[in-house]
């Protein structure tokens, strides 16, 4: 997710060079960012992340805040240095005035500045009355591994750690870095205080009312008493965490963040930079009934984000707010009336609801699948996660109408057995934050740094776009979307999947001269097709052209608008296997799917034509979504008819590796 | 390693109270409560209650309420029951053990209630 | 009187298997996961065997197992030993509390 998402703010102070006292200038052409909460109450002014760049040392860390200090002492003011982060993100937390920002933008080795912001708890109500624990049968919930292998960490409140459902399994760390309680007239009542930290212990591995129940957590203290922390309090904790692991290296780490703060680019970064250390982190979307790409950590992409589901599976709503939702969602889990650990008693059990809840689920959920297959990547148990949950059951009226073809349908369900799934190909669906509407805006879709990219769409509610393509950036293949003039804007749709050894490339053909279309096809030995993508110049993309059909046996072929450059996903990965699949429709129609067989898992959705009435083509689960225009708005006939195509591909090779290890 | 250590035996006349003490050690001592089991001579065991040595807070069983208090001394990592109105059917080996869970207990103590 | 009923005496030979039952209600047995079962030897604490239904703690033979359906839970003893001669107590979580059984008495013949 973009560091433009929604109305994150980014304010750039300019340099200004008559300004005294600098050894060292910043590398021309940089400039430095500052950046803030963009929600005004959750701001904490006076208290700043600096944050340096990727390679900076410890000592040259210390060594920028010390000039920092003697730079602003000579101005008359009092700096204070709050902590030095190394191990996570290089950097520092300063307390200062805010006119010191412009002087503390141009030090060296600077690349940001973010003022500090609270994040919230999000589980409500707190407390509800006593309830008595709930009844199991004797064989209902018996999971063949409790996650006994794995270790939780668990950023939240204090706990009650002797509570009887997780008494032995919550390891209290020291770690505690919280704000002062709200109010003069605040009394700290130890079980409040505790309340939403038991409770969410209790739902990750309780004894009697957890998923993992195997699963040993350890604490640490970022919230309150009110459930209220800070951005570099959480900060702070992530790095103690990875300290922790480097200093004692242990299995697999599960990250539970069951907070939610306004869109921050520094916790966005550290959570980036501990799940590529290999740590599990999992978060709740939000409690706000809002795009969760507007929170954070909920909107960083390696982090598994939450939402919240009831017992109907229908998203959560909580008061005059609800689960948030949207594309930086990853799944859904049960967070409405999850019965847990009470902090009122040591052997009380209440309520709460919320997208805490729902993290903590999937965070137990994820500690099982860890403990029976310890080596799993975290592309490949986000992947498992998608893949074991129920599809198509969330009322998605419930959502805003423009977030819902961005809203997984997903909640999340233990795998039936939490080994032997190794033999599937693995694909999710990535969109793209959107484009905005110039006329040359695009939008940008990325796969995670172990996934392959095997085909990408675009999509755009108005249909003026000019399609999409895939492109080398950083050394790895990204899935760009076009935007058109007079166009609201366009996603890009991502078709990620895991395919070990896998060595893929893009074929491209030029807009053809003939009427015939353009086509493209894998000409390496060995390699198959496993994606189509078109891309035009043109405004306008032959609205009254005769739609092109695909030339029958010619199943490695994409063909296309004769104005389009067509692109080809070509792969070759051991026993990958791929074919096509279309559905037409002669009658105009507003959606036309594709599914998969059983066995077979979508790679690639693409529409024929790619005439200008086609708003785009999309995967949902194992099904090609292709989306026109209104029909009562469509011209003619034969202009409404849309194919739609879809690349299902399976690996015998994953499927025999698979059979071996049986 | 994880010990639980008790007082040594008391013998007391009805009407009177005793005080047992149990040091903990060898464990993160927050992360477990104390329960407290009596087994009278050739009898079952009996739960007597339970006490936080995170917070204090205490948990007794119905039979005993009134007559039992426990309390915790966190800078020793001491915790105490105290049985008051002492009756001969109270003479039992008295044990403390770690948490609800009960994995790791004293070596007992005996208390004789006797005229 | 015990809240959960165990019989009270069981015997086997060496080598033998037995299995010594625990029975309450869905209050306690029945409702929840925790239930535990200790040995006692004469003049000594007791000591846990089985936790949790059916999890060993480190250091106990695999020889001692639990199962639990609906509101009786078993320990079962495999290839007795004239070691395992003791008494047996389970225990279980109710609502607020916690309960014992009377205890049974295991003797190898």
């Known amino acids: 997710q973009e560091d433009e998402d929604g109305d994150y703010e980014e304010l750039v102070l300019a340099l200004r060079s008559e300004e005294d006292g600098l050894a060292e200038a910043p590398e021309h052409g940089t400039t430095a960012t500052f950046h803030r909460c963009a929600k005004d109450p959750w701001r904490l002014p006076g208290t700043y992340v600096v944050v340096l760049k990727e390679e900076t040392h410890l000592s040259q860390s210390e060594r920028t805040a010390r000039r920092l200090q003697a730079q602003a002492a000579r101005r008359g003011y009092l700096t204070k240095i709050l902590h030095v982060f190394h191990g996570l993100l290089p950097g520092f937390l300063v307390k200062m005035s805010g006119d010191l920002l412009e002087l503390a933008l141009k030090l060296p080795h600077v690349d940001y500045i973010e003022e500090d912001s609270s994040v919230f708890a999000q589980s409500i109500p707190w407390n509800l009355e006593r309830i008595t624990p709930p009844r199991y049968r004797a064989d209902e919930y018996q999971p063949p591994d409790g996650g006994s292998l794995v270790e939780v960490y668990l950023l939240d409140t204090s706990i009650q750690s002797d509570h009887r459902e997780i008494e032995g399994r919550v390891m209290v760390t020291d770690f505690e870095n919280v704000p002062e309680e709200d109010g003069t007239r605040f009394h700290r009542q130890a079980s409040k205080c505790d309340s939403h930290g038991t409770h969410l212990a209790g739902v990750v591995s309780g004894r009697d009312a957890g998923v993992a129940k195997g699963a040993s957590m350890r604490s640490l203290r970022v919230l309150n008493c009110q459930g209220k922390g800070t951005v570099s309090g959480t900060l702070i904790g992530l790095e103690f965490i990875r300290k922790s692991q480097l200093v004692q290296p242990v299995g697999p780490l599960v990250v539970l963040l069951p907070l939610a703060g306004g869109y921050s680019r520094v916790l966005n970064a550290a959570c980036q930079r501990l799940a590529r250390a290999g740590v599990v982190l999992v978060t709740a979307a939000g409690n706000f009934r809002d795009d969760a790409c507007l929170y954070s950590p909920a909107s960083a992409p390696e982090v598994i984000t939450v939402g919240a589901t009831n017992a109907q599976d229908q998203p959560v709503t909580l008061g005059t707010l609800g689960t948030n939702f949207g594309r930086c969602v990853d799944l859904f889990a049960p967070g409405e009336d999850i019965i847990g650990a009470s902090s009122d008693c040591s052997t009380c059990f209440v309520s709460q609801s919320g997208t805490s809840q729902a993290a903590a689920h999937v965070a137990g959920i994820a500690a099982m699948m860890l403990s029976a297959e310890p080596e799993l990547t975290l592309a490949e148990l986000r992947q498992r996660l998608i893949h074991f949950s129920a599809k198509d059951v969330i009322n998605e009226a419930w959502f805003p109408e423009d977030q819902r073809v961005l809203t997984p349908n997903l909640v999340a369900a233990l795998p039936p057995s939490t080994h032997g799934a190794g033999w599937q190909l693995f694909c999710r669906t990535v969109w793209s934050a959107h484009s905005g509407p110039t006329r040359m805006a695009t939008a940008v879709a990325r796969c995670a740094p172990d996934e392959e990219l095997l085909s990408c769409s675009s999509f755009s509610r108005s249909g003026k776009r000019r399609g999409e393509r895939m492109e080398a950036q950083g050394g790895k293949l990204v899935c760009r979307a076009h935007n058109a003039f007079g166009g609201e804007g366009v996603y890009a749709i991502a078709r990620c999947c895991l395919l070990p050894q896998a060595n893929c490339s893009v074929h491209t053909a030029p807009p053809a001269e003939a009427s015939m279309g353009t086509r493209v096809h894998c000409h390496q030995q060995g390699h198959v097709l496993t994606g189509c993508s078109s891309h035009w110049e043109v405004e306008d993309l032959g609205t009254h052209k005769p739609p092109v059909l695909r030339p029958r046996g010619q199943p490695n072929q994409c063909v296309g608008h004769r104005e389009a450059s067509i692109h080809a996903s070509c792969c070759h990965a051991p026993g990958l296997e791929c074919k096509v699949k279309e559905h037409g429709i002669p009658a105009p129609q507003e959606q036309v799917t594709v599914a998969c067989e059983e066995g077979w898992t979508l790679t690639g959705c693409s529409a024929l034509p790619g005439t200008s009435h086609v708003l785009g083509a999309y995967a949902v689960d194992n099904t090609c979504v292709v989306r026109s225009r209104d029909v009562s708005t469509t011209g003619s006939t034969s202009e409404g008819a849309v194919t739609a195509v879809a690349i299902c591909c399976r690996s015998r090779h994953l499927a025999q590796a698979s059979q071996e290890l049986q | 390693q994880i010990q639980l250590v008790q007082s040594g035996a008391e013998v007391k006349k009805p009407g009177a109270s005793v005080k047992v003490s149990c040091k903990a050690s060898?464990?993160?001592?927050?992360?477990?409560?104390i329960s407290w089991v009596r087994q009278a001579p050739g009898q079952g065991l009996e739960w007597m209650g339970w006490i936080s040595a995170y917070n204090g807070n205490t948990n007794y069983a119905q039979k005993v309420q009134g007559s039992v208090t426990m309390t915790t001394d966190t800078s020793t990592s001491t915790v105490y029951m105290e049985l008051r109105s002492l009756r001969s059917d109270d003479t039992a080996v008295y044990y403390c053990?770690?948490?609800?869970?009960?994995?790791?207990w004293g070596q007992g103590t005996t208390v004789t209630v006797s005229s | 009187q015990s809240a959960l009923t165990q019989p009270a005496s069981v015997s086997g030979s060496p080598g033998q298997s037995i299995t010594i039952s625990c029975t309450g209600t869905?209050?306690?047995?029945?409702?929840?996961?925790?239930v535990s079962w200790y040995q006692q030897y004469p003049g000594k604490p007791p000591k846990l065997k089985i936790y949790?239904?059916?999890n060993r703690p480190s250091g106990v033979s695999n020889r001692f197992s639990g199962s639990k359906s609906g509101n009786t839970a078993s320990l079962t003893i495999s290839g007795l030993q004239a070691e395992d001669e003791a008494d047996y107590f389970c225990s279980s979580y109710t609502s607020t509390s916690m309960v014992f059984g009377g205890g049974t008495k295991l003797t190898v013949l």
């Open positions: 060898g464990y993160p001592l927050t992360s477990y409560g």
């Open positions: 949790e239904v059916s």
């Open positions: 869905s209050s306690d047995v029945g409702g929840y996961n925790s």
């Open positions: 053990a770690r948490g609800y869970g009960m994995d790791v």
